[in-house]
């Protein structure tokens, strides 16, 4: 293109991209009609006075991944049409006051991944049209009152990955249009009452990976439009009774990686729209009746990696829409026969890595749609007659790592397993633990008459065959959380998170591990 600087490329006459280590200053001359300018991966260290003076039509300016550490206050003079400005991934420690003056059209300002130590009210006082402000990945230790007071149209504010130790209750008070507030990965220990009161349109609040110990009872009472609340990986040991009372729109709540010891009935709700509740990696020891009864639309409930030893028969009352229930890696020894009776739509249940010694025969009586059951690594010696008979959709059953007692009583189970082998998976099969002479042999192919020669056992297949459906998908829906590939973190749907890494260590957790928390 005629007019495109030699060290740049122009995919269109108005769109300039300048990249490479050989660039040490803003290239000149830039096309007078340039609408977008990208200066990426260069060795530019400073922006002097008015380097963009002759390109007043500029709409988008990206100066990213450079060595930029110093900007003159008048660097962006004459860019009244600029709507998008990114200075992300540079080495800025200080923003000059007045840098954004005159940028009356600015809507998005990206200052993430720099080394900013502080921001002041004067920095953004001219940016009245700003809708998105990204400050994550800096070294901010506090936000002064008034810093955002002029940003009344702001809809997204990201302050994640800084060093904030406290937040003033007044700092967000004028942000009535804010929809997304991210404060994850800071050092917040508590959040004062009233901090979020002005955020009446807030839809997402990300507070994960801080050091919050206590939540004020009315902290979220004004956030009636909140849909996603991330509180995972904090130090929360108890939940005030009314803390989640005013959140009718909430559909995702993450509380994993805290120090919760108990959940009192009524703590969650009413939340008629909650679809996902993540509570793994806490210290919960029991689940009382009706603890989740307000969550009529809940589909995913993750309670794994706690210390649950007792589940009240009515603990899961009200969860008629639940699809996934994860209870693995707890301290369960016994389950009441009615505990899952209300879960008519349950598809996947993970109970592995507990201490279950036996299961009631009616444990899955009303859960006809079950597709996956994880029972590996418990203390099961046998299972009641016909326990799986009615589960026509069952296509994944894990029974290995249990101390199966292969005497004559095991025959009905053995026969059923023989007829339903594909459901057991090919990786690990259940093996006998006793008697000693058959220890380690496959439960499916064991000859019980050899194992217990003195007992005559009639070959009666008391476990009628349940048809095997090879075409039935194990997990028909993408939100499914099977515990063989179980998510330990919900994929929190924004892009500032560390890359999600999958580790498939099935012998221990069999989960997807996300660094994000």
């Amino acid at each position: 293109y005629h007019g495109c600087p030699s060290e740049c490329t122009c995919s269109r006459a108005s769109q300039v991209e300048c990249t490479g280590a050989r660039i040490v200053a803003v290239p000149t001359p830039l096309p007078w009609n340039a609408m977008s300018l990208q200066i990426l991966n260069t060795h530019i260290t400073e922006l002097n006075e008015s380097p963009f003076l002759n390109i007043s039509a500029l709409i988008a300016l990206r100066i990213e991944k450079n060595e930029l550490s110093r900007i003159t206050p008048g660097a962006f003079r004459n860019l009244g049409s600029l709507r998008y400005l990114s200075l992300a991934n540079n080495k800025l420690q200080v923003l000059p006051i007045g840098l954004f003056q005159g940028l009356d059209s600015l809507e998005s300002l990206l200052l993430s991944s720099n080394q900013l130590l502080q921001i002041q009210p004067a920095h953004f006082s001219q940016c009245s049209n700003l809708k998105e402000l990204q400050l994550h990945g800096n070294h901010l230790e506090y936000i002064p009152d008034g810093a955002f007071d002029h940003l009344v149209g702001l809809t997204k504010l990201n302050l994640g990955k800084n060093s904030l130790t406290h937040i003033s209750p007044r700092v967000f008070q004028h942000l009535g249009n804010l929809q997304v507030l991210r404060l994850y990965e800071n050092r917040l220990t508590d959040i004062p009452m009233g901090t979020f009161d002005g955020l009446v349109n807030l839809q997402e609040l990300a507070l994960q990976q801080n050091q919050i110990g206590l939540l004020s009872p009315g902290l979220f009472h004004n956030n009636h439009n909140l849909q996603r609340l991330y509180l995972s990986n904090n130090h929360i040991s108890q939940l005030p009774p009314s803390v989640f009372m005013q959140l009718p729109q909430l559909n995702r709540l993450t509380l994993f990686g805290n120090s919760l010891k108990e959940l009192s009935p009524g703590i969650f709700g009413p939340m008629p729209n909650l679809r996902e509740l993540w509570l793994y990696d806490n210290h919960i020891s029991s689940l009382p009746d009706n603890v989740f009864s307000n969550l009529r639309q809940l589909q995913v409930l993750i309670l794994s990696r706690n210390q649950i030893s007792f589940i009240s028969p009515g603990a899961f009352n009200g969860l008629t829409e639940l699809r996934e229930l994860s209870l693995h890696t707890n301290a369960l020894q016994d389950l009441d026969g009615n505990v899952f009776r209300m879960l008519a739509n349950l598809q996947n249940i993970s109970l592995q890595n507990n201490r279950l010694r036996q299961l009631p025969g009616n444990i899955f009586a009303n859960v006809n749609g079950l597709m996956a059951i994880q029972l590996q690594n418990n203390q099961l010696e046998n299972l009641p007659l016909g326990i799986f008979d009615h589960l026509g959709k069952l296509c994944e059953l894990r029974l290995y790592d249990n101390p199966w007692r292969c005497d004559s009583d095991i025959l009905p189970l053995r026969n059923w397993l023989l007829l339903n082998q594909p459901r057991l998976g090919t990786d690990t099969v259940p093996v006998c633990f006793s008697p000693a002479n058959v220890r380690g042999q496959s439960l499916i192919i064991i000859n019980v008459n050899v194992a217990v020669p003195s007992v005559h056992v009639p070959e009666v297949p008391s476990y009628p065959e349940t048809p095997w459906y090879p075409d039935t998908p194990s997990y028909p829906d993408t939100t499914s959380v099977s515990s063989t590939t179980e998510l330990t973190s919900p994929v929190e749907d924004y892009t500032d998170l560390t890359t999600i890494q999958v580790t498939d260590d099935r012998s221990v957790w069999g989960m997807t591990q996300a660094q994000s928390g």
Epitope: S11, R12, A13, Q15, A60, S108, L110, K131, E132
Partner: antibody
Amino acid sequence: QVQLVQSGAEVKKPGSSVKVSCKASGGTFSSYTISWVRQAPGQGLEWMGGIIPMFGTANYAQKFQGRVTITADESTSTAYMELSSLRSEDTAVYYCARGVALLATDFDYWGQGTLVTVSS
Amino acid sequence: QSALTQPASVSGSPGQSITISCTGTSSDVGGYNYVSWYQQHPGKAPKLMIYEVSNRPSGVSNRFSGSKSGNTASLTISGLQAEDEADYYCQSWTHDNSVVFGGGTKLTVL
């Protein structure tokens, strides 16, 4: 080669909302404008709005302001267009489209289109 | 913003040349050299034929050319062929950083 793959056809009732997705592959997602263009049966093309995913904020045609929401998820390279308060006149094929530069002054790549039918 | 004005239909015989006009205002066509042209066959997505008034993307035949005078842009197709029969749309960048299309022109190859 850039590809834009859209979600499947939808049938909606008047007054409801529809959300159409557009997954991009074969190129950087974040630093290109994704626009949404619709075409009613037998009618012309109509630009609804666009978004540069890395900047997050969308730009809308005046006609659709307040009724359309365009968002982008950089982690999945997917753009979304949600249209609310549907009426029968919104029955159309909805296309996502992308240019070759940060700001799209023209559209080199198009999705296959998603038919949205609004009917009681 | 109002749609740009195009003739509803044009026709020509194989081998002939035809021109489709696209009229806007100084806020769109007249104010910027960002006029594009698209070809759309029935049931298919549009295809970019011309960008920035007169530039052709790679793979587009040089029988297609574009020009602009004042507030009116034009698409000329020379050596008309049967496969050129389609709908053609002009499109322009506008003063409020948005995009506007023309109403479309049906080209019939006789």
